[in-house]
Amino acid sequence: IWELKKDVYVVELDWYPDAPGEMVVLTCDTPEEDGITWTLDQSSEVLGSGKTLTIQVKEFGDAGQYTCHKGGEVLSHSLLLLHKKEDGIWSTDILKDQKEPKNKTFLRCEAKNYSGRFTCWWLTTISTDLTFSVKSSRGSSDPQGVTCGAATLSAERVRGDNKEYEYSVECQEDSACPAAEESLPIEVMVDAVHKLKYENYTSSFFIRDIIKPDPPKNLQLKPLKNSRQVEVSWEYPDTWSTPHSYFSLTFCVQVQGKSKREKKDRVFTDKTSATVICRKNASISVRAQDRYYSSSWSEWASVPCS
Amino acid sequence: RNLPVATPDPGMFPCLHHSQNLLRAVSNMLQKARQTLEFYPCTSEEIDHEDITKDKTSTVEACLPLELTKNESCLNSRETSFITNGSCLASRKTSFMMALCLSSIYEDLKMYQVEFKTMNAKLLMDPKRQIFLDQNMLAVIDELMQALNFNSETVPQKSSLEEPDFYKTKIKLCILLHAFRIRAVTIDRVMSYLNAS
């Protein structure tokens, strides 16, 4: 058993039918010695008397808010949450496995640049009685500071019969140098509590591996005289690290017909312009990627050919 | 401690091409190592990230773009003095700071070259003959070093008398390749910046 925060305790349980459970001793936070009784949640049934209460915790019915009283007056509370260990593996019932880029990916994180700022998000089908708290650091043995905001509900979507809720959090490394070569990963830790169930999720990454630039901006077409060709031009996104000659991007230019089945023409360039053939009803899209370290491509920026 | 913006004329920068080749070569070699050593801990998540140049060179700091010198987090106080007769920039405008930067890159390459050659000698003794260093990568390191053209003492190739532990050697190869790829990215960024300046 360990303390999550004041008066909230987590009991770690080997979780299988008929498991023996854990013996827990609760102590009433009071100078009083006698006349103390204990109750659980809203029930008035007295579970025991005395300054300490010993309970065998085996299932969720044994968790909840234990209160010690004296003569009708509340002395203190202890909220017991359960952390299930199924076959030696901590349970992951609260968050959905996003399965990208691999199974057991519960947290996903992205950074728009090398400033040390990043966003993480996760999914759940649970809509109520749910709280999250997020901590982060650079490295774990001698951790360096990363400050995270509060997790907020960022999207809701319907998936089949279920509603899916997306939560996200923004974090900023306290002293980040965009040019630094990372040798210690960023660690992100999310505590999740649903009713009386506690779970924790972690992700470990280097900023360089989660880079996803914003799409190129000011995408423009300039028709070339007496030709079906156009000059496409664009600019680096505002959010990308500077100087651009040091933090260079490479680009992919795509001409896509109206029908998804039509052949796509693609050109790769390090410049911020390209000459392509504009077909009727087609659109031109451009996306960006770090030129030297192949992390994710940005989303496409698009303009119609017409 | 940083790169001045006023640097040589465009097209006077032969190192950019070599640095791009270097990054391509090390990335290919790392990919090959990951595939060949699939049952070894060779992914970025599995390895310890070690930098063999730590406390010996200060490439990131010495090659910091001018725009980042205002960022206090970038200004570590590691100073190293280097020989300053680099010819990569073929220009008298080459400042002391730039020479320090290029000299630091040269020292990095020399250190990795020695490590890779020592490691290759061990891998050649492996009866499994599972993996060897790509000769192209070693050649590209050499070409960039020649383009940088610094005079420095040659570091003797390490030789060890004890029987090599091939498992450990292959894990060390993965660690080295990961670190060298990161350094190659920095070198490429620096060369691109200098070329544009």
Partner: antibody
Amino acid sequence: EVKLVESGGGLVQPGGSRKLSCAASGFTFSDYGMVWVRQAPGKGLEWVASISSGSSNIYYADTVKGRFTISRDDPNNTLFLQMRSLRSEDTAMYYCARNPYWGQGTTLTVSS
Amino acid sequence: DIVMTQSQKFMSTSVGDRVSVTCKASQNVGTNVAWYQQKPGQSPKGLIYSASHRYSGVPDRFAGSGSGTDFTLTISNVQSEDLAEYFCQQYNSYPLTFGGGTKLELK
């Protein structure tokens, strides 16, 4: 006493469908992840699918992905395995399990 | 996929003996390994989880050990009711995979 009782097996033609059920008792079913495992005649054990408590996470073996669907009905303490596009190689004894307990199994035969 | 190899398909033993059933994973699975017992004509039953933890009610003559890629189920003081097939299983990553089984027979 913990009990898992499978039902729904039988003879099915190739390409056909079948839904297996597993009735659980003796434990708080909704609080536990569950799995389906199968065993072809005279062969070893093969994991088929898993479902977490609350159905938030579901995983399938590649051999059944897209054809089988695992689901649960917590109020009725029942686990299901909906099987479609059945093949002869799906012939096996199907067990539902929540370690260390396994049901007695239900036999599915896919044959024309 | 992780392959779990039980190299011995059959093992002969006598009542009162100590026997060790081995299992090898094709890659590191930490301690995320379980052992099952299946008696002829019956369904399997879980014995060990996390490589070395016994489920409650499992006799203490059953002991699991190992981590990484090499795992062992040891039955000390074999009883006649222990004559069965034993399967190892990894649950470190999906798909979950079982060993091919080792049948324990009387000499």
